[in-house]
């Protein structure tokens, strides 16, 4: 069995060959704020192995097609603003550009 | 209980389309986030794209640019449209519900509906 927040991508009769990330963040993972560029925001990492990074929803439930893989599963999305993380700690962000 | 009824498969010729639909009843709300799987004859079951609940879609390498996923919330009805139909896309199609849940281990093929055959030859 895949762990909490994987999904089995292949699977046999009884028994998952694949595992990967799950690729639809959970619905309060999703709302991030829109003026977020304006400010220094720090942003918590998920925990390795969970979820995936989240993009906003789109507006009106189907997205144009997008090219960023994830895992082995693509996302569509209309805005595609995520930033990977790729640490447990939190990262500071700035709009800045110091 | 949620129950599935998945219909639309037929025989196609590559290059052809079809529109699969997966008809959910037993649901409070408008329904948890939704799966497409496939088994194609001798194979394992495949992820082939997903959809949540407020409409965001993710598709397996395979389908991307081909094939569309969409749902009808009020209709409790999810849709998965199939273009430029290959014949290595021959296989039963089912839907599975809350995939993050009941899609961890096992086989997430068959356990809900029927699913419905698509075959594609010329």
């Known amino acids: 069995e895949c762990r909490p927040g994987m999904i089995c991508a292949t699977s046999a009769t009884n028994s998952c060959a694949r595992c990967v990330p799950y690729p639809i963040c959970a619905a309060e993972t999703v709302t991030k704020p829109q003026d977020m560029a304006e400010k220094d925001t720090t942003f918590e990492a998920p925990p390795l192995g969970t979820q995936p990074d989240c993009n906003p929803t789109p507006e009106n439930g189907e997205a144009p097609a997008s090219t960023s893989p994830t895992q082995s599963l693509l996302v569509d999305s209309q805005a595609s603003k995520t930033l990977p993380i790729p640490t447990s700690a939190p990262v500071a962000l700035s709009s800045t550009g110091k | 209980e949620v129950q599935l009824v998945e219909s639309g498969g037929g025989l196609v010729q590559p290059g052809g389309s079809l529109r699969l639909s997966c008809t959910a009843s037993?649901?409070?709300?408008?329904?948890?986030?939704m799966a497409w799987y496939r088994r194609a004859p001798g194979n394992e079951c495949e992820l082939v794209s997903i959809?949540?609940?407020?409409?965001?879609?993710y598709y397996t390498d395979s389908v991307k640019g081909r094939f569309t996923i969409s749902r009808d919330n009020a209709k409790n009805t999810v849709f998965l449209y199939l273009n430029s139909l290959q014949p290595e896309d021959t296989a039963v199609y089912y839907c599975?519900?809350?995939?993050?849940?009941?899609?961890?281990?096992?086989?997430?093929?068959?356990?809900w509906g029927p699913g419905t055959q698509v075959t594609v030859s010329s």
């Open positions: 599975a519900p809350d995939p993050r849940r009941n899609c961890r281990g096992g086989d997430c093929c068959g356990n």
């Open positions: 037993g649901f409070t709300d408008d329904g948890p986030d």
């Open positions: 959809i949540s609940a407020d409409g965001r879609t």
